[in-house]
Amino acid sequence: VPRWRQQWSGPGTTKRFPETVLARCVKYTEIHPEMRHVDCQSVWDAFKGAFISKHPCNITEEDYQPLMKLGTQTVPCNKILLWSRIKDLAHQFTQVQRDMFTLEDTLLGYLADDLTWCGEFNTSKINYQSCPDWRKDCSNNPVSVFWKTVSRRFAEAACDVVHVMLNGSRSKIFDKNSTFGSVEVHNLQPEKVQTLEAWVIHGGREDSRDLCQDPTIKELESIISKRNIQFSCKNIYRPDKFLQCVKNPEDSSCTSEI
């Protein structure tokens, strides 16, 4: 008799999830010599322990604490790049500007990037059929709690000038409901962070508007200023040229506005 299984509204656990996490861990520790001491089997065991046999709507930050401990890593606090709705460009940037870090450049972020996972209460099975959707089912699901936890800790670690890349093509360039808007903004530490500098990335070739004047950017400035952190904003009119100039800053065309 087939066992009844809870049907959730979101996609199920990513295929080959255990193998993917383990393989990513091994790859990361090979690429980053300072992390070569990490025992990837222990990392997987801690990751698994956070959600296996637990109700997927009842996950807490505490569940991920053993994993957090194993993911201990040096991140220069003044080299942090946050992003919202423009992940690919942020990652392309840190691949070139190697001394800056997005969350996904850390071990923990790298392990979980673009993956979905959940378990079932009282069974050791991983649910590959469906997982809770943040809106339709519950917010305390394994994926959402993981990203909320690591995003909060990442923002708490930041200091001096923190950069954030925002998508100028979105109707809400700054979205209060994004992870950046709901978690990271509120966990920057005013005693450590002097300035939040927003980079608004333009989508259209001929778009010469000053998107730093957008109402949602003004809203971000207001939130940040109330937290006693300075705010600055730059338009990145040509993201392709921006990346090219990060690669080759001596190029003569890189002195003009990008």
Partner: nanobody, 117 residues
């Protein structure tokens, strides 16, 4: 600007004790969780212990549980790590850091603990 200065390290025999101190300045010390992390020769960063801002809550790595005790004196802006029953594998540079991790930045120079007979 957050600044920390670790002290109290040294050479000690296996089974011995040391007390590390960390003097902090540049921020409201009592508002922040504080941690000890360590780096053994040729190894990566390892989290050791964390204490809440008030001092009411502590957490330890399994490898030091029952042997190390983290504490703080908020009136002196100072963090401590009492290390008992020291082992050769505790040999490392010990750093104190603001926050609870897992992401840390070195603020101080650290203090070297060498456990050897």
């Amino acid at each position: 600007e957050v600044q920390v200065l670790e002290s109290g390290g040294g050479l000690v025999q296996p089974g011995g004790s040391l007390r590390l101190s960390c003097a902090a300045s540049g921020f409201t010390f009592s508002s922040y969780a504080m941690s000890w992390v360590r780096q053994a020769p040729g190894k990566g960063l390892e989290w050791v212990s964390t204490i809440s801002g008030s001092g009411g809550s502590t957490d330890y790595a399994d490898s030091v549980k029952g042997r190390f005790t983290i504490s703080r004196d908020n009136s002196k802006n100072t963090l401590y790590l009492q290390m008992n029953s020291l082992r050769a594998e505790d040999t490392a540079v010990y750093y104190c850091a603001d926050g609870r991790g897992p992401f840390f930045d070195y603020r101080g120079q650290g203090t070297l603990v060498t456990v050897s007979s």
